[in-house]
């Protein structure tokens, strides 16, 4: 049974899905494979802290150390990438903070995406000095393991020289790499000695070998690509939003809820209200009123604007977001001051997401 009573019948489901949301991402911690990573749970007054990764309980093991409010991952691998959460359990409530861990190398092999510096990799030789192929910039080839999130662009580079100018070809897992081997194909920029794959997917995982050759010799270099898969997850709300606010009677105020969701989120703004002088129904559950929800007739559901407020508008405002996987919610308080007092923005505090408990 639901843990609240609705004051009025409100159609909560959108008649038509609103636009796709991907507004705010949780904080991202990046580590290279093999590195150690330490994250502090950014929640206050925690009696007990529990940790999860992609919704599954996280316990200590030979690489994961949990000490107080700190999570340490030793010798990170791409499998450590994912959506993490720490939950602080207190005597009266609990609160959860989400963050992403991304164990990945730089997206391109030692180079920026635009290849502006590529011209110097194309070395021109004196026509008399015949020379087998050689690497001209080994620094750009040092990172062999590339762990990249799905949908990102990957670039592998093998800057080389030789006389006559060598040719370059690419192998995947030791076999000729053909355009039809991946959806969307790939680009080879010979003047930059690079292979570019856009929007990588897990099937792109493998060993990529550049073979650079001329009539005097052949050299090769192998990169390993690991594509870190995403998992669908429930909505994530930006910490600290909505923020507590205060205004004078007759003033205007705005609450903002920043949402990150892979799947269509359904946003509701809810307020605790009284009915017949009571805040709770006969079943002991609080009376709640849906003030606004995403749908065909609702503009910018992440923002709740209140105009010409009265003292009756004071109280707790809840931003509740759901998708097909689950829910998230955070709340803020509105303080309405008498006209003679000047309003001020209160310190931004995230109220407990477990408001329905």
């Amino acid at each position: 049974r639901p843990s609240f009573s609705l004051v009025e019948d409100t159609t909560l489901e959108p008649e038509e899905p609103p636009t796709k949301y991907q507004i705010s991402q949780p904080e991202v911690y990046v580590a290279a494979p093999g590195e150690s990573l330490e994250v502090r749970c950014l929640l206050k007054d925690a009696a007990v802290i529990s940790w999860t990764k992609d919704g599954v309980h996280l316990g200590p093991n030979n690489r994961t150390v949990l000490i107080g409010e700190y999570l340490q991952i030793k010798g990170a691998t791409p499998r450590d990438s994912g959506l993490y959460a720490c939950t602080a359990s207190r005597t009266v409530d609990s609160e959860t903070w989400y963050f992403m861990v991304n164990v990945t190398d730089a997206i391109s092999s030692g180079d920026d995406e635009d290849d502006t510096d590529g011209a110097e990799d194309f070395v021109s030789e004196n026509s008399n000095n015949k020379r087998a192929p050689y690497w001209t910039n080994t620094e750009k080839m040092e990172k062999r393991l590339h762990a990249v999130p799905a949908a990102n662009t990957v670039k592998f580079r093998c800057p080389a020289g030789g006389n006559p100018m060598p040719t370059m070809r690419w192998l995947k897992n030791g076999k000729e790499f053909k355009q039809e081997h991946r959806i969307g194909g790939y680009k080879v920029r010979n003047q930059h000695w690079s292979l570019i794959m856009e929007s990588v997917v897990p099937s792109d995982k493998g060993n990529y070998t550049c073979v650079v050759e001329n009539e005097y010799g052949s050299i090769n270099h192998t990169y390993h690509l690991d594509v870190v898969e995403r998992s669908p997850h429930r909505p994530i709300l930006q910490a600290g939003l909505p923020a507590n606010a205060s205004t004078v009677v007759g003033g205007d105020v705005e609450f903002v809820c920043k949402v990150y969701s892979d799947a269509q989120p359904h946003i509701q703004w809810i307020k605790h209200v009284e009915k017949n002088g009571s805040k709770y129904g006969p079943d002991g559950l609080p009376y709640l009123k849906v003030l606004k929800h995403s749908g065909i007739n609702s503009s910018n559901a992440e923002v709740l604007a209140l105009f010409n407020v009265t003292e009756a508008d004071a109280g707790e405002y809840i931003c509740k977001v759901s998708n097909y996987i689950g829910q998230a919610n955070q709340s803020a308080w509105l303080t309405v001051l008498p006209k003679q007092q000047a309003p001020g923005r209160e310190k931004e505090i995230t109220a407990s997401p477990d408001y329905l408990e």
């Epitope: 049974r1 639901p2 843990s3 609240f4 489901e13 959108p14 038509e16 899905p17 636009t19 796709k20 999860t52 919704g55 599954v56 309980h57 997917v201 998992s231 669908p232 997850h233 429930r234 892979d262 799947a263 269509q264 359904h266 759901s322 998708n323 097909y324 996987i325 689950g326 829910q327 477990d354 329905l356 408990e357």
Partner: antibody, heavy 114, light 107 residues
């Protein structure tokens, strides 16, 4: 590992009710919806409804509203789907699935016959 | 409710063939579609979510594409173990509706 284990097969009379259980393990039960989906013999899949165990919020397919009741017990990490006023066309396999539909129960065959 | 129209309802193909199934939504659903494989007597198995993301452990021969109302599911090279019924499902708005299914058989 993540598991959803459902209760056993049931044979019911028309007009009666059935309550199917789905015990979850291997993940945080309160962090995901639990969906209920049914499949009549030789037919396709039909979503009945879902519940968010953390606060009991439930959502239903209009076709089942008033007949289906989905509940959850956080203390035992178990979700339930009760279907009342059974008729022969409710004979189906009933599945529970975790919120992301990545994990499903093994299914519970409910046979409605006089 | 959003209707999901899946086609074809059945198809026969040979091992190694490229197989394509389409799903059309009655309303725009962005990329909120999943594809499932179901074998007789078994629960459905998630293959693709959010239109194009292969779920963990799903072979690379399975892929999905599309956005808005038109979606495609592809098996690049059919294997004998792929014989099953495939369903699309929109997870944009409740009720989360499924397509009627495509039964895939080996020639």
């Amino acid at each position: 590992q993540v598991q959803l284990v459902q209760s056993g097969a049931e044979v019911k009379k028309p007009g009666s009710s059935v309550k199917v259980s789905c015990k979850a393990s291997g993940y945080i039960f309160t962090s995901y919806n639990v969906h209920w989906v049914r499949q009549a013999p030789g037919q396709g899949l039909e979503w009945i409804g879902s519940i968010y165990p953390d606060n009991g919020d439930s959502s239903y397919n209009q076709n089942y509203r008033g007949r289906a009741t989905i509940t959850a017990d956080k203390s035992t990490s178990t979700a339930y789907m009760e279907l009342s006023s059974l008729r022969s066309e409710d004979t189906a396999v009933y599945y529970c699935a975790r919120g992301d539909f990545a994990y499903w129960g093994q299914g519970t065959l409910v046979t409605v016959s006089s | 409710d959003i209707q999901m129209t899946q086609s074809p309802s059945s198809l026969s193909a040979s091992v190694g063939d490229r197989v394509t199934i389409t799903c059309k939504a009655s309303n725009g659903i962005s990329n909120d579609i999943a594809w499932y494989q179901q074998k007789p007597g078994k629960a459905p198995k998630l293959l693709i979510y959010s239109a194009s993301y292969r779920y963990s452990g799903v072979p690379s021969r399975f892929s999905g594409s599309g956005s808005g109302t038109d979606f495609t599911f592809t098996i690049s090279s059919l294997q004998p173990e792929d014989i099953a019924t495939y369903y699309c499902q929109q997870h944009s708005t409740t009720p989360y509706t499924f397509g009627q299914g495509t039964k895939l058989e080996i020639k």
